[in-house]
């Protein structure tokens, strides 16, 4: 059975998939769909990696992990929920049937209505973390500075998030990342 | 419009071998994974194997993987399967069929050749 | 390996019956079922995919449906065309797999 994320709608939801390349730089093509994998690619796909870099990708689907080091978890932007359901993603190991293919259940709760009158803002800007622009040359990161004026809901939506960091690691150390080589 | 051409079948004795061709046309073939299936006369379909966009995955009916080996030459627009220490069940015809595209979505063969017949018999 | 069972094996019918052939899977394949149609002496074709997305060229009296286990494909209107025989096929599991094929024929 799939394992189950969480996410709010108008929130970023976080889905996570790790592999370790063979070599730095010795990269694997990764893709991510809408829907259960199917025994070959990643049903509708919304995003994927070559051995170089992201090659295709739709719009609020984004990697903010080190793709290049193997985190390929894949960020949803501002989720509606319609974008419910479950999601693969395929680790395509070249030779004779060696992918590696997850299935992650995303499950979207109605946003909790807070009488707070701060300005909403997205929860990365909250948590300093790397992004990777999209695009076809080099990758670029930048680090997002945190803001002062944080509301409660980013507060529970930061736990939130630390929470799914814990988890993501714990998912690593309990043996979900992939190595290769 | 889309085209696929087997060539290569034809009679062999029990043990010996075949490559079988498949010539696409119509399509960016390296968009597309592709497959091999066959039918022994009579019978159903069965699946043989598939090979990703640029064939460096390759996927195969476990009783056949030691002795087929499915390949492809995209600078050709070729598909190619090498069949050794061929059997008399493995007679059937072959079909060519373009499979998934690079971006998923439609999970069925949308395309077949015309088919090859290979005969394994002494 | 996932076991594809369709009923029935064979079906007579007459040009203007509705017909529906069932595949059941033996295990969930969510939507990954296809739909083929094979003259005698002929390649097969693709009628429908993702268990209910009609293939270029069909004809709409073609109907899919289904998800999970168990699947459908419906002939509104049987034309003399399409007596012949049809196969469903999943494409979640490998190795992929065909149903063993429910042979339409004329009454």
């Known amino acids: 059975s799939e394992v189950e994320y969480r996410a709010e709608v108008g929130q970023n939801a976080y889905l996570p998939c790790f592999y370790t390349p063979a070599a730095p730089g010795n990269l694997v093509p990764v893709c991510w769909g809408k829907g259960a994998c199917p025994v070959f690619e990643c049903g509708n796909v919304v995003l994927r990696t070559d051995e170089r870099d992201v090659n295709y990708w739709t719009s609020r689907y984004w990697l903010n992990g080190d793709f290049r080091k193997g985190d390929v978890s894949l960020t949803i932007e501002n989720v509606t929920l319609a974008d419910s359901g479950i999601y693969c993603c395929r680790i395509q190991i070249p030779g004779i049937m060696n992918d590696e293919k997850f299935n992650l259940k995303l499950v979207i709760k109605p946003a909790k209505v807070t009488p707070a009158p701060t300005r909403q803002r997205d929860f990365t800007a909250a948590f300093p973390r790397m992004l990777t622009t999209r695009g076809h040359g080099p990758a670029e990161t930048q680090t997002l500075g945190s803001l002062p004026d944080i509301n409660l809901t980013q507060i529970s939506t930061l736990a939130n998030e630390l929470r799914d960091s814990r988890l993501a690691n714990d998912l690593r150390d309990s043996g979900a990342t992939i190595r290769i080589g | 419009e889309v085209q696929l051409v087997e060539s290569g079948g034809g009679l062999v004795q029990p043990g010996g071998s075949l490559r079988l061709s498949c010539a696409a046309s119509g399509f960016t073939f390296s968009d597309y994974y592709m497959a091999w299936v066959r039918q022994a006369p009579g019978k159903g379909l069965e699946w043989v194997a598939n090979?990703?966009?640029?064939?460096?995955?390759?996927y195969y009916l476990d009783s056949l993987k030691s002795r087929f080996t499915i390949s492809r030459d995209n600078a050709k627009n070729s598909l190619y399967l090498q069949m050794n220490s061929l059997r008399a069940e493995d007679t059937a015809v072959y079909y060519c069929?373009?499979?998934?595209?690079?971006?998923?979505?439609?999970?069925?063969?949308?395309?077949w050749g015309q088919g090859t017949l290979v005969t394994v018999s002494s | 390996d996932i076991q594809m069972t369709q009923s029935p094996s064979s079906l007579s019918a007459s040009v203007g019956d509705r017909v529906t052939i069932t595949c059941r899977a033996s295990?969930?394949?969510?939507?990954?079922l296809a739909w083929y149609q094979q003259k005698p002496g002929k390649s097969p074709q693709l009628l429908v995919y993702n268990a209910k997305t009609l293939a270029e060229g069909v004809p709409s009296r073609f109907s899919g449906s289904g998800s999970g286990t168990d699947f459908t494909l419906t002939i509104s209107s049987l034309q003399p065309e399409d007596f012949a025989t049809y196969y469903c096929q999943q494409h979640y599991g490998s190795p992929l797999t065909f149903g063993q094929g429910t042979k339409l024929e004329i009454k």
């Open positions: 069929a373009r499979d998934v595209g690079y971006y998923g979505g439609n999970y069925g063969f949308a395309y």
């Open positions: 090979i990703n966009y640029d064939g460096s995955s390759t």
């Open positions: 295990d969930n394949i969510y939507s990954y």
